[in-house]
């Protein structure tokens, strides 16, 4: 079960006077009065710590990565898991705790002087080794802040969208990540039908720009589910 792989982290309770309801990611199933959470209380643990469902590492905390909680488990069910400490096994950089990276399947300390060369080697090592992502880069702030001093232009290698200049996002391209343009109105976008499908994209698109959302194109409503075209449309 999921409980066996979760750390026992208690949730902070709300102090008065700001006693709003405890919340959950928006979806169609209500797990607590007034707040939406996909899947209800399926992953409720004894101390009320509910793991966070995710599609990619960037959605998790800084000391977590996104993966299936069971070895060889369903790639469609992914949650944020505690990062791996030094000398623990890994398949990609994001699995290792901040200050470490994945080299030859083991989390090792990142020597900043050598890290840039090492990460280029391990991009190819990481390709295809893990179901939940194809990129060899981590999203760790501790690493990226020292590696990047200026905002990346289109085509620049990046770790996360904040590494890219305005109007660009960090998206997968083969097994690295580069700055690509944020999508404009009318451009084709990717609507992820299931959790974890981000990890299957070798050529990842950016998200739709501000004020736009990825919706099915009006004249494609009659098409079959598999061939439906989504475009960025005004809210």
């Amino acid at each position: 079960t999921l409980n066996s792989v979760l750390n026992s982290n208690a949730i902070k309770n709300l102090p008065p006077p700001l006693g709003g309801a405890a919340g959950h990611p928006g979806s169609a199933v209500s797990a607590a009065p007034g707040i939406l959470y996909p899947g209800g209380n399926k992953y409720q643990t004894i101390d009320n710590y509910q793991p966070y469902p995710c599609a990619e590492d960037e959605e998790c905390g800084t000391d977590e990565y996104c993966a299936s909680p069971t070895r060889g488990g369903d790639a469609g069910v992914q949650i944020c898991l505690a990062c791996r400490k030094r000398r623990k096994r890994c398949m990609r950089h994001a699995m290792c705790c901040p200050g470490n990276y994945c080299k030859n399947g083991i989390c090792v300390s990142s020597d900043q002087n050598h890290f840039r060369g090492e990460i280029e080697e391990t991009i190819t090592e990481s390709f295809g080794n893990d179901h939940s992502t194809l990129d060899g880069y981590s999203r760790r702030t501790t690493l990226s802040s020292k590696m990047y001093h200026t905002k990346g232009q289109e085509g620049s290698v990046c770790l996360r969208s904040s590494d890219c200049a305005s109007g660009l996002c960090c998206a997968r391209h083969f097994w690295s990540k580069i700055c690509k343009p944020v999508l404009k109105e009318g451009q084709v976008c990717t609507k992820h039908r299931r959790k974890g499908s981000h990890g299957l994209e070798i050529f990842q698109r950016c998200y739709c720009g501000e004020g736009l959302s990825c919706r099915i194109q009006k004249d494609h409503h009659q098409a079959s589910n598999s061939s439906r075209l989504h475009t960025c449309q005004r809210h």
Partner: nanobody, 129 residues
Framework: EVQLVESGGGSVQAGGSLRLSCTAS????????MAWFRQAPGKEREFVAA????????HYAESVEGRFTISRDNAKNTAFMQMSSLKPEDTAVYYC??????????????????????WGQGTQVTVSS
């Protein structure tokens, strides 16, 4: 000094729309979740909507799901909330807030107000029937 400044509030008829903006200054907020909370007279402050640092996740209170849309522009350090099909019960002071990306995250993180380090002064939204 870090500041969050809300704008876009006002009075509107039921069924109408408003767009709230929250501009952050004093530090980059790309590693923060941005959220909106609201407080109606005589009631506790309640979670409305949040958008993650990754921009890939949005979270809504059940009462606004499908009517409100939260978005953000990291380059401009600004968050937005498009509110449509407004109801009289949406009348409240709306507060913008920013929560840092935590070490560990749970499903409760985004709607737990004590996780938010920075708060705006609020903007009044009044919906009349």
């Amino acid at each position: 000094e870090v500041q969050l400044v809300e704008s876009g509030g006002g009075s509107v008829q039921a069924g109408g729309s408003l767009r709230l903006s929250c501009t952050a200054s004093g530090r980059p907020f790309d590693n923060y979740a941005m959220a909106w909370f609201r407080q109606a007279p005589g009631k506790e402050r309640e979670f409305v909507a949040a958008i993650s640092w990754s921009l890939t996740r949005t979270h809504y209170a059940e009462s606004v799901e499908g009517r409100f849309t939260i978005s953000r522009d990291n380059a401009k350090n600004t968050a937005f909330m498009q509110m449509s099909s407004l109801k009289p019960e949406d009348t409240a002071v709306y507060y913008c807030a920013a929560a840092p990306r935590p070490k560990r995250i749970s499903v409760r993180y985004f709607s737990t107000s004590s996780n938010y380090d920075y708060w705006g002064q609020g903007t009044q939204v009044t919906v009349s029937s």
